[in-house]
Interface confidence: medium
């Protein structure tokens, strides 16, 4: 599923991401935009043999199990395919673990490069939340 901007903002808010670990909702919507272009079925392969999955591009080396990433830790204890569902529950729950891990949203390269320090509230402007 490819979410609309405000549709995703509402879904993320419903799942408790607004101000989760101090990150406003705009940060999460911005991250999703630049990680997956709001596409729940996005997959991207990395040079280390891992793959990133879903709307927040969660990595198979650390966070989920795709059955083929050497040394996968599967810290979210889920199959990576669950992160590709049109229901973002699994992605949000795993993202909460990731953002709690110490580096905050710096874990997402796209957030670091494209969202951090910008007017992220623009990503939820005009949305009825």
């Amino acid at each position: 599923k490819v979410f609309g901007r405000c549709e995703l903002a509402a879904a993320m808010k419903r799942h408790g991401l607004d101000n989760y670990r101090g990150y406003s909702l705009g940060n999460w919507v911005c991250a999703a935009k630049f990680e997956s272009n709001f596409n729940t079925q996005a997959t991207n392969r990395n040079t280390d043999g891992s793959t990133d999955y879903g709307i927040l591009q969660i990595n198979s080396r650390w966070w989920c199990n795709d059955g083929r990433t050497p040394g996968s830790r599967n810290l979210c204890n889920i199959p990576c395919s669950a992160l590709l569902s049109s229901d973002i529950t699994a992605s949000v729950n795993c993202a909460k673990k990731i953002v709690s891990d110490g580096n905050g949203m710096n874990a997402w390269v796209a957030w670091r490069n494209r969202c951090k320090g910008t007017d992220v509230q623009a990503w939820i402007r005009g949305c009825r939340l």
């Epitope: 040079t47 043999g49 050497p70 199959p79």
Partner: antibody
Framework: QVQLQESGAEVMKPGASVKISCKAT????????IEWVKQRPGHGLEWIGE????????YYNEKFKGKATFTADTSSNTAYMQLSSLTSEDSAVYYC?????????WGQGTTLTVS | DIELTQSPATLSVTPGDSVSLSCRAS??????LHWYQQKPHESPRLLIK???QSDSGIPSRFSGSGSGTDFTLSINSVETEDFGMYFC?????????FGGGTKLEIK
């Protein structure tokens, strides 16, 4: 137990297309990538590409882009590979395998003859 | 693409001999190297995964070693059922690639 059952041998004319199937049983089909591998005598094994049935995500070896197309039907736990514009170079045994990094589970192979 | 070169192309041995098959990668692939055996008209069968991990049901005479670019499959005291083709495969990067194979034949 995990099994991958491929469709039977095919004899096709040059220029035609063929669709090979791979039915998976014994595991959660949507969770694992399905890989496709080509084997020609004297040419060893070649990785064609892969599909993740749960999402339809596909990746192709550059060499096979435009030649192979992968699809999957999650209702029947079956992956498909269509090969188009067939030539004698496409005559080979085609295998599906479950993409575990290493390929522990293989189909029995589908022999394609283009003549 | 990562190229895998297997040597020798053919190995003629007598049952009871011990042999080593080589697989060399064109760049480092860490330990992401797997070995398969294939008999005529059969699908490949996984022998060793991630350089040295023996798969379940594989006889203990098969072992693997190496890292980086140089890998070895060893068969301690070859049995008649071991004859066939042996392929290595890397899963370090895409596209996945296979070696050209080593044919193990009876002398």
């Amino acid at each position: 137990q995990v099994q991958l059952q491929e469709s039977g041998a095919e004899v096709m004319k040059p220029g035609a297309s063929v669709k090979i199937s791979c039915k998976a049983t014994g595991y959660t089909f949507t969770t694992y990538w399905i890989e496709w591998v080509k084997q020609r005598p004297g040419h060893g094994l070649e990785w064609i590409g892969e599909i993740l049935p749960g999402s339809g995500s596909t990746y192709y070896n550059e060499k096979f882009k435009g030649k192979a197309t992968f699809t999957a039907d999650t209702s029947s736990n079956t992956a498909y590979m269509q090969l188009s514009s067939l030539t004698s170079e496409d005559s080979a045994v085609y295998y599906c395998a479950r993409g575990d990094g290493n390929y522990y589970y293989w189909g029995q192979g589908t022999t394609l003859t283009v003549s | 693409d990562i190229e895998l070169t297997q040597s020798p192309a053919t190995l003629s041995v007598t049952p009871g001999d011990s042999v080593s098959l080589s697989c060399r990668a064109s760049q480092s692939i860490s330990n992401n190297l797997h070995w398969y055996q294939q008999k005529p008209h059969e699908s490949p069968r996984l022998l060793i995964k991630y350089t040295s991990q023996s798969d379940s049901g594989i006889p203990s005479r098969f072992s693997g070693s190496g890292s980086g670019t140089d890998f070895t499959l060893s068969i301690n005291s070859v049995e008649t059922e071991d004859f066939g083709m042996y392929f290595c495969q890397q899963s370090n990067s895409w596209p996945r690639t296979f070696g050209g194979g080593t044919k193990l034949e009876i002398k």
